[in-house]
């Protein structure tokens, strides 16, 4: 039975040209995290595998930095980066947990972090 929950940074906003940290955290389970995949709608951004380290997709390699931890830093933001991002935790023996983050990239300097929230 899957007992874990994923806590994410929730709905966040950032300024165009700036950077943002996408962060998820898996709790309430003793399952071993074998890999975390980061995706944006229909594109893979990066994979962090416990044994192999990081894979950064070529379309993002110039502006995605691994970490901190299992998170991902997205740099040189554009308005086109607005949208949903998913952290997909591959665990043993539980299986897969998915968290969702919505990023809004703003033209002005009114960017503020949203509240944290949980997805079971």
């Amino acid at each position: 039975m899957m007992t874990g929950t994923i806590e994410t940074t929730g709905n966040i906003s950032a300024e165009k040209g700036g950077s943002i940290i996408l962060q998820c955290h898996l709790s309430s389970t003793t399952a071993q995290v074998t890999q975390v995949n980061w995706e944006q709608q229909d594109q893979l951004l990066a994979i962090c595998n416990a044994d192999l380290g990081w894979h950064i997709s070529p379309s993002f390699k110039d502006r995605v930095a691994p970490g901190p931890g299992l998170g991902l830093t997205l740099q040189s933001l554009t308005v086109n980066d607005t949208g949903e991002y998913f952290c997909i935790y591959h665990t043993y023996p539980d299986g897969t947990y998915t968290g969702r983050i919505f990023l809004e990239v703003l033209e002005s300097s009114v960017a503020e972090h949203g509240a944290r929230f949980q997805i079971p």
């Epitope: 074998t34 890999q35 995949n37 995706e39 229909d42 594109q43 893979l44 990066a46 994979i47 595998n49 416990a50 044994d51 192999l52 380290g53 990081w54 894979h55 950064i56 997709s57 070529p58 379309s59 390699k61 691994p66 591959h90």
Partner: antibody, heavy 119, light 107 residues
């Protein structure tokens, strides 16, 4: 120039073991991942596993657990595939392939090592 | 394990024709797919990755597309030297897996 040079063809008896080598040159060995692939005559490619020579971390295809052991010697830039309890089903070409840095895209391949298990 | 299914084991085409090879993943693999070419007696060669980027030195007649579970590899104007087996491969989750291969035959 990046190169992966594999050891030569092997003819071995059933029940024995063999160690295939893959020597890397032209790059920082510990910045690469090395994967191993198996191909029986006239058949497709099958993934055996992958090793991170920097950390020693390995991942295996469940099918090859107990059959294959992946190791790497950082001092000599050599990755090894050891195969044990050999049977005729293990007769195949074994390839090593390398992927640089933050990538799981394997763009450098060895020439292949032919293993024949026969009594 | 994720199964990568290439529906055609063989495809026959003529020089100058366009040909497409399809690959279907048994579950979501996002864009973590590459295509290899293996000519008789040779090691596989990386052609396309991620899954629409052409590897260095690969002619622009080779293209790839897809996301999620459905992927396509296309040769826009087949040349005689394209006689080979083409494999799709996913690295979305371990164990990484290959498609069964599609052998391209030139009429």
């Amino acid at each position: 120039q990046v190169q992966l040079q594999q050891s030569g063809a092997e003819l071995v008896s059933p029940g024995t073991s063999v160690k295939v080598s893959c020597k890397a040159s032209g790059y920082a060995f510990t910045n690469y991942l090395i994967e191993w692939i198996y191909q029986r005559p006239g058949q497709g490619l099958e993934w055996i596993g992958v090793i991170n020579p920097g950390s020693g971390g390995t991942i295996y295809n469940e099918k090859f657990k107990g059959k294959a052991t992946l190791t790497a010697d950082k001092s000599s830039n050599i990755a090894y595939l050891q195969l044990s309890s050999l049977t005729s089903d293990d007769s195949a070409v074994y390839f090593c392939a390398g992927s640089y840095g933050s990538s799981y895209t394997f763009d450098y391949w060895g020439q292949g090592t032919t293993l024949t298990v026969s009594s | 394990d994720i199964v990568m299914t290439q529906s055609h084991k063989f495809l026959s085409t003529s020089v100058g024709d366009s040909v497409s090879i399809t690959c279907k993943a048994s579950q979501h693999v996002s864009t973590a797919v590459v295509w290899y070419q293996q000519k008789p007696g040779q090691s596989p060669k990386l052609l396309i990755y991620s899954p629409s980027y052409r590897y260095t030195g690969v002619p622009d007649r080779f293209t790839g597309s897809g996301s999620g579970t459905d992927f396509t590899f296309t040769i826009s104007s087949v040349q005689a030297e394209d006689l080979a087996v083409y494999y799709c491969h996913q690295h979305y989750s371990t164990p990484w897996t290959f498609g069964g291969g599609t052998k391209l035959e030139i009429k």
